[in-house]
């Protein structure tokens, strides 16, 4: 058993059939010594008197708030929550696995840039009794800080016949230096609590792994007269690290007809225009990518070609 | 060319070879993603290799103010990654095969450490420690992880030349 | 919790050969290369040996022909044997190891040691 | 080899003072790279194996109180005790593990004046 927060615990249970459990004593927060009883949740029936109560912890049913009582008036509470192992195995109930980039993938990162900050999410089908805590730090042995948000709902989604939600959080680290080699990866770590069931879900990264640039902006099209061609040209986006000259992106153009099948013309350029033959109906895309460091390329860029 | 404790480097020759390390580094191992190194084991080895950090001086205000504390640590880094890729943990079994890219990158290593410090100049005698013996089945986690540090080593590298090639040529 | 020990005969004859075995337990010895140091009475300490995570070895020079450091991986044992002993081979030997890394690392954990006296 | 030459042999420093141990090698043990010196320190009581106190020259191994520290470069190292505690009287060493084979100092001998 561990203090998750004041008067909050939560007991580590080997879930399997006939279980043995884990005994728990629990103290009430008094300086009284006589006449103290204990119930459970919202139960009237008298689980045990004196100033500790010993209980074995199986399920559910053994979890809750216990609280301990003197001639009706209440001394204080200890909710005990349960962290189910099953065959060795932490239990990962509460969250949906994204499967991406590879199975157990719970939390998902991303950084617009180098500064230090960055967004996480996860999915959950979970409408009710839910709760995050989220902590971060650069390494785990002499610990950075990150400070980390509130964790909100920042999506719902019908998936099939089930809702989906999606919470998200955003993180920054306390002293980053965007210019230096990260050694120590960031290590993020969620708390998840749904009714009287704990997990915890981890992740750890470098921020120039889950770097993703938001899309180009200003993306033009200039014609070029007596030609087919149209000079492209798009500019940075304002979230990227500055200045340029050291933050450098890589572009990639596509000229896309209507039609899906259509074959796509590429061209790789690290300059900020291209010269691209725009076809009837077609449509001109810019994505982003670090030029130096192959992280995730940017959503596209789109215009049309008319 | 780069004189210690003096002129500049050939910034743009440099930013050229280090743009082209960076190639070489993800086309030695591209599928970086796809194998996640901190189940592995992986806190030895990332601390047993360079890093470029906060106060080398490699931000863009540092190189402003003295580009050669940055190009030293660079130059450092540079000739331990030579060492490392000219080791048996890449020169032995499980042999690489006849196209890969090792053989170019470390050729590219050894010759931006030249470009920063041609002949006849030294900020010092670069030391590395006797190599832990490696046997076939740990050489390709150490190559991976190796590659892998490398290419974080190198975009630094190739930001630092970049900006230079941009804003501190003559 | 890593732990070694040290086991093997207080005393060997002069000629002979000595040999210990160390028994590491509460760790993966994947990980870990494991050394044996030794130290003569009211003396300093001198390496012998290292035995390294994939199996092969390294000995100090002046040790050389006459040590063997060999494991038995199903066991978790390690084994120490030097040969035509002489009384200048009367230490405490301890067996150590050290983190796999790319380079050889610090003894982090020692066994208690035995005490070997050569002596007719 | 590389010779590991520790001083002074030996130290009587009172309850309280400081206590300082040099050990100097033969060759540098800073890899310029990593910037890391190969290098630790041990503390040895009667009858006990050595216990690592200091590695990479100056972090200092979890557990060992924080009068413990370790500072120096390249050829010269040095272990300082802040304020000298009954229980650490002992004898020191000092190891590298830059090059084979291990080499240690030869002891200093630390006692209460």
């Known amino acids: 058993i561990w203090e998750l927060k004041k008067d909050v615990y939560v007991v580590e249970l080997d879930w399997y059939p006939d279980a043995p459990g884990e005994m728990v004593v629990l103290t009430c927060d008094t300086p009284e010594e006589d006449g103290i009883t204990w119930t459970l949740d919202q139960s009237s029936e008298v689980l045990g008197s004196g100033k500790t109560l010993t209980i074995q912890v199986k399920e559910f049913g053994d979890a809750g708030q216990y609280t301990c009582h003197k001639g009706g008036e209440v001394l204080s509470h200890s909710l005990l929550l349960l962290h189910k192992k099953e065959d060795g195995i932490w239990s990962t109930d509460i969250l949906k696995d994204q499967k991406e980039p590879k199975n157990k993938t719970f939390l998902r990162c991303e950084a617009k840039n180098y500064s230090g900050r960055f967004t996480c999410w996860w999915l959950t089908t979970i409408s009710t009794d839910l709760t995050f805590s989220v902590k971060s730090s650069r390494g785990s042995s002499d610990p950075q800080g990150v400070t980390c948000g509130a964790a909100t709902l920042s999506a719902e989604r019908v998936r099939g016949d089930n809702k989906e939600y999606e919470y998200s959080v955003e993180c920054q680290e306390d002293s980053a230096c965007p210019a230096a080699e990260e050694s120590l990866p960031i290590e993020v770590m969620v708390d998840a609590v749904h009714k009287l069931k704990y997990e915890n879900y981890t992740s750890s990264f470098f921020i120039r792994d889950i770097i993703k640039p938001d899309p180009p902006k200003n993306l033009q099209l200039k014609p070029l007269k007596n030609s087919r061609q149209v000079e492209v040209s798009w500019e940075y986006p304002d979230t990227w690290s500055t200045p340029h000259s050291y933050f450098s992106l890589t572009f990639c153009v596509q000229v896309q007809g209507k039609s899906k099948r259509e074959k796509k013309d590429r061209v790789f350029t690290d300059k900020t225009s291209a010269t691209v033959i725009c076809r009837k109906n077609a449509s001109i895309s810019v994505r982003a990518q670090d030029r130096y460091y192959s992280s995730s390329w940017s959503e596209w860029a789109s215009v049309p070609c008319s | 060319r780069a004189v210690p404790g003096g002129s500049s480097p050939a910034w743009t020759q440099c930013q050229q070879l280090s743009q082209k390390l960076c190639t070489l580094a993800w086309s030695a191992h591209p599928l970086v993603g796809h194998m996640d190194l901190r189940e592995e084991g992986d806190e030895e080895t990332t601390n047993d290799v360079p890093h470029i950090q906060c106060g080398d001086g490699c931000d863009p205000q540092g190189l402003r103010d003295n580009s050669q504390f940055c190009l030293q640590r660079i130059h450092q880094g540079l000739i331990f990654y030579e060492k490392l890729l000219g080791s048996d943990i890449f020169t032995g079994e499980p042999s690489l095969l006849p196209d890969s890219p090792v053989g170019q990158l470390h050729a590219s290593l050894l010759g931006l450490s030249q470009l920063l410090q041609p002949e006849g100049h030294h900020w010092e005698t670069q030391q590395i420690p006797s190599l832990s013996p490696s046997q076939p089945w740990q050489r390709l986690l150490l190559r991976f992880k190796i590659l892998r540090s490398l290419q974080a080593f190198v975009a630094v590298a190739a930001r630092v030349f970049a900006h230079g090639a941009a804003t501190l040529s003559p | 919790q890593v732990q070694l020990q040290e086991s093997g005969p207080g005393l060997v004859k002069p000629s002979e050969t000595l040999s210990l075995t160390c028994t590491v337990s509460?760790?993966?010895?994947?990980?870990?290369?494991v050394h044996w140091i030794r130290q003569p009475p009211g003396k300093g300490l001198e390496w012998i040996g290292v035995i390294w995570t994939g199996g092969s070895t390294d000995y100090n020079p002046s040790l050389k022909s006459r040590v063997t450091i060999s494991r038995d991986t199903s066991k978790n044992q390690f084994s120490l044997k030097l040969s035509s002993v002489t009384a200048a081979d009367t230490a405490v030997y301890y067996c150590a190891r050290d983190k796999y890394g790319l380079f050889p690392g610090y003894f982090d954990y020692w066994g208690q040691g035995t005490l070997v006296t050569v002596s007719s | 080899d590389i010779v590991m030459t520790q001083s002074p042999d030996s130290l009587a420093v009172s309850l309280g003072e400081r206590a300082t141990i040099n050990c100097k090698p033969s060759?540098?043990?800073?890899?310029?790279?990593?910037?890391?010196?190969?290098l630790a320190w041990y503390q040895q009581k009667p009858g006990q194996p050595p216990k690592l106190l200091i590695y990479y020259a100056s972090t200092r191994q979890s557990g060992v109180p924080d009068r413990f520290s370790g500072s120096g470069s390249g050829t010269d190292f040095t272990l300082t005790i802040s304020s000298l505690q009954a229980e650490d009287v002992a004898v020191y060493y000092c190891l590298q593990h830059f090059n084979y084979p291990w080499t240690f100092g030869q002891g200093t001998k630390l006692e209460i004046k």
């Open positions: 060759q540098s043990l800073l890899s310029s790279g990593n910037r890391k010196n190969y």
């Open positions: 509460g760790g993966s010895l994947s990980s870990y290369n």
